[in-house]
Interface confidence: low
């Protein structure tokens, strides 16, 4: 059997929203050889699946064979190296994999200028491995709520924060002129999930953007 | 152990192409997302394009759309980048970087865990 081979520290998942990757760190001293063993258990269905037999990746999608997660107790990860016909301990994922461990984001957000507000859509995720069924607002039905980051361009970047209870939302500019830059991340009240910073979008707003009224 | 090599860079006139490689250790290829970044004297490091090298899928910044093409190739674990129709403010070192941090936004330097040392990338008109 030869020498024990190491287990790798750590594996954990790294999701957003149907896009679900396992992550682990490498053994040390690893050789040209080696690679990793990952299996996949669904609460509630107490036995290993084998998902990959020798990836020599530090990482893996496990989004195809976990597109139930919001809709099911959850799933746990294990890894271990294999070196020919050597192989270490599992690592398990030391936490549950579930819906409250995605990390909420926006697909994009769309500016436009309307007597003197800036008006912005939020643009909801649309991966295209989710089931048809399986949107954002149908998973997150309630309470969906969004932190906007406003900066003004030119200025000192100052943000304004502002939360939206809406993927509408109206900004006023009190009459300035400029670049405004929108930033937006996504929670939903009732949940814990983190929530990933929008790219920042920007629209510029001249004096012909404002109506004149007596 | 894990490295990424950039290579490909040079001088070059405007409107002229160049292909920059960056090659990945075996256990870096595939980790999330790799991408290229530039940045030129005096200013913040860029991000150009990135690869989800699980898929392929890819992203570009809105400035490069178009003139540039970011690639892959899963038996030499390279990815690469393509630019064309290239312009004096093309000039740049660019830096090849992989594992995007979770929670973190894709086109920003922070999010990158590994980088390469640079390939020199100078335009002239």
């Known amino acids: 059997h030869g020498t024990e081979l190491p287990s790798p520290p750590s594996v954990w998942f790294e999701a957003e929203f149907f896009h679900h990757i396992l992550h682990w760190t490498p053994i040390p001293n690893q050789s040209e050889s080696t690679c990793y063993e990952v299996a996949l258990l669904r609460y509630g269905i107490e036995s290993w699946n084998s998902i990959s037999n020798c990836s020599q990746t530090l990482s893996y999608d496990l989004t195809a064979v976990t597109l139930d997660l919001y809709h099911s107790n959850g799933y746990r990860a294990r890894v271990r190296a294999v070196d020919g016909s050597r192989h270490s301990n599992w690592t398990v994922t030391n936490t549950r994999f579930s819906v409250d461990e995605v990390t909420l984001t926006v697909g994009s957000v769309n500016l436009e200028i309307h007597n003197g507000f800036i008006l912005g859509k939020i643009q909801l995720p649309r991966p295209k491995m989710a089931p048809a069924n399986d949107t954002y607002e149908s998973i997150f039905s309630h309470f969906r709520e969004y932190e906007i980051a406003i900066r003004k361009v030119p200025g000192n970047f100052t943000f304004t924060h502002k939360k939206v209870k809406h993927e509408n939302f109206s900004l006023l500019t009190s009459g300035e002129v400029g670049e405004f830059c929108v930033q937006v991340k996504p929670s939903v009240a009732s949940r814990s999930n983190k929530g990933m910073w929008s790219k920042e979008e920007c629209i510029s707003l001249t004096r012909q953007y404002f109506t004149v009224t007596n | 152990q894990v490295q990424l090599q950039e290579s490909g860079g040079g001088s070059i006139q405007a409107g002229g192409s160049l292909r920059l490689s960056c090659v990945a250790s075996?256990?870096?290829?595939?980790?999330?997302?790799m991408a290229w970044f530039r940045q030129s004297p005096g200013k913040e490091r860029e991000a150009v394009a990135a690869?989800?090298?699980?898929?392929?899928?890819?992203l570009y910044s809105d400035s490069n759309k178009g003139r540039f093409t970011i690639s892959q190739d899963n038996a030499k674990m390279t990815v690469y980048l393509q630019m064309n129709s290239l312009k004096s403010e093309d000039t740049a070192m660019y830096y090849c970087?992989?594992?995007?941090?979770?929670?973190?936004?894709?086109?920003?330097?922070?999010?990158?865990?590994?980088w390469g040392q640079g390939t020199q990338v100078t335009v002239s008109s």
């Open positions: 970087a992989a594992v995007r941090k979770t929670g973190s936004y894709l086109f920003d330097a922070q999010s990158f865990t590994y």
């Open positions: 690869i989800y090298t699980a898929s392929g899928a890819t």
């Open positions: 075996k256990y870096l290829y595939s980790t999330n997302y």
